[in-house]
């Protein structure tokens, strides 16, 4: 039959950070092409990445419609040049992905310290509220707007001259910490969703230190 050399996709894997979501799979195609379908548990299948030779498909546009829904994808394999061909059961070979719930599973991207400002013995540290690809009323929502209070940030800070780290946490994107006058401090932040069971934490942000351009000092 026309499907003799067609193999089903395998190792279907969701790769998602801040809701940018790509489905990846194997194998690299030899004389075959792929089409991906995605649906919610209760919805209809929607086809994406038609007859592609890629082994990935960007499904962001679909999952951002409702990030709290649970999605399932499947990858169909077709013989190259004969995409009408079906398998022995009368339909093309396909493989299902694991279920994926973006709100609960998307990785938290590496945060960025937007600014820090010293006033006397206090430093205000602000974390950049990164835009996601989730849309509402035509505008892209920030990470905070999507996750609300489910998202907290942890600040790690230490004197430039020592290695002993202190921490602070916040339900917003701002910290206000006490520092010793005349000392320079370094900062790093991490995004955390404490209520999650997987992918709870981001990687740490790049370290920013006082005495560099990003900060501001006021007596």
């Amino acid at each position: 039959s026309g499907t003799t050399n067609t193999v089903a996709a395998y190792n279907l894997t969701w790769k998602s950070t801040n809701f940018k979501t790509i489905l990846e799979w194997e194998p690299k195609p030899v004389n075959q092409v792929y089409t991906v379908q995605i649906s919610t548990k209760s919805g209809d299948w929607k086809s994406k990445c038609f007859y592609t030779t890629d082994t990935e498909c960007d499904l962001t546009d679909e999952i951002v419609k409702d990030v709290k829904q649970t999605y399932l994808a499947r990858v169909f394999s077709y013989p190259a040049g004969n995409v009408e061909s079906t398998g022995s059961a009368g339909e093309p070979l396909y493989e299902n992905s694991p279920e994926f719930t973006p709100y609960l599973e998307t990785n938290l991207g590496q945060p960025t310290i937007q600014s820090f400002e010293q006033v006397g013995t206090k430093v205000n540290v602000t974390v950049e509220d990164e835009r996601t690809l989730v849309r509402k009323n035509g505008t892209f929502l920030t990470l905070r707007q999507v996750f609300g209070k489910d998202l907290i940030y942890t600040l790690y800070y230490w004197k430039s001259s020592s290695s002993g780290k202190k921490t602070a946490k916040t339900n917003t994107n701002e910290f206000l910490i006490d520092v010793d006058k005349g000392e320079n401090y370094c900062f790093s932040v991490q995004a955390v969703i404490p209520s999650r069971t997987v992918n709870r934490k981001s990687t740490d942000s790049p370290v920013e230190c006082m005495g560099q351009e990003k900060g501001e000092f006021r007596e």
Epitope: K136, Q145, V146, K149, T170, T172, F175, L176
Partner: antibody, heavy 125, light 108 residues
Framework: QVQLQESGPGLVKPSQTLSLTCTVS?????????WSWIRQHPGKGLEWIGE???????RYNPSLKSRVTISVDTSKNQFSLKLSSVTAADTAVYYC??????????????????WGKGTTVTVSS | EIVLTQSPGTLSLSPGERATLSCRAS???????LAWYQQKPGQAPRLLIY???SRATGIPDRFSGSGSGTDFTLTISRLEPEDFAVYYC?????????FGGGTKVEIK
């Protein structure tokens, strides 16, 4: 200063949907606070129902989640509560409240610092 | 869910006396997420203490909060006539946010 005012029917029939609106005056609903609904059964303690951010991000009490919808209308400076399939057990005083960030120990945490006066809802046929 | 148990249920005291109210959590609560409210009959609750120990705006310094982990305390150093009310503790760290059952402070 910010004031909150609940409005909606005081009497709802069993199995119907309870609908309440909270109007925010003296400030913008989009100003970085969260907006909550809390209820108090007659002579009893307080029960948190859920909250919403101006962006529409919500959190609900799991015990009510299947029946509750909280929504926000930034153009009207209002947020609303819908509670479906009500029974006599939903008879209570319903409060709306503002959840605003307070500084504590290096960070900011949200507390319910402004409340509406409350509206009594009775579920009865 | 985190259950908050308040004791005593009722506290009968005279004006000028000291009131000590307890709130015990079924599991550890970060101090950052613990609040106390006062409620008078026919009125909405009023935020007194946040972060377990910080007074909200306009709250007299006779009100103080303390504690950590699972045990928290609200103290009213000298009761004024307007302090007779019901007091609730609340945790806002874990959904669902929960309130204690309340302690009624009544005039003896």
């Amino acid at each position: 200063q910010v004031q909150l005012q609940e409005s909606g029917p005081g009497l709802v029939k069993p199995s119907q949907t309870l609908s309440l609106t909270c109007t925010v005056s003296g400030g913008s609903i989009s100003s970085g606070q969260y907006w909550s609904w809390i209820r108090q059964h007659p002579g009893k303690g307080l029960e948190w129902i859920g909250e919403i951010y101006y962006s529409g991000s919500t959190r609900y009490n799991p015990s009510l989640k299947s029946r509750v919808t909280i929504s926000v209308d930034t153009s009207k400076n209002q947020f609303s509560l819908k509670l479906s399939s009500v029974t006599a057990a939903d008879t209570a005083v319903y409060y709306c409240a503002r959840d605003t960030p307070y500084y504590y120990d290096g960070g900011y945490y949200y507390y319910m610092d402004v409340w509406g006066k409350g509206t009594t809802v009775t579920v009865s046929s | 869910e985190i259950v908050l148990t308040q004791s005593p249920g009722t506290l009968s005291l005279s004006p000028g006396e000291r009131a000590t109210l307890s709130c015990r959590a079924s599991q550890s609560v970060s101090s950052s997420y613990l609040a106390w409210y006062q409620q008078k009959p026919g009125q909405a609750p009023r935020l007194l203490i946040y972060g377990a120990s910080s007074r909200a705006t306009g709250i007299p310094d006779r009100f103080s909060g303390s504690g950590s982990g699972t045990d928290f305390t609200l103290t009213i150093s000298r009761l004024e006539p307007e302090d007779f009310a019901v007091y609730y503790c609340q945790q806002v760290g874990v959904v669902p946010y929960t309130f204690g059952g309340g302690t009624k402070v009544e005039i003896k």
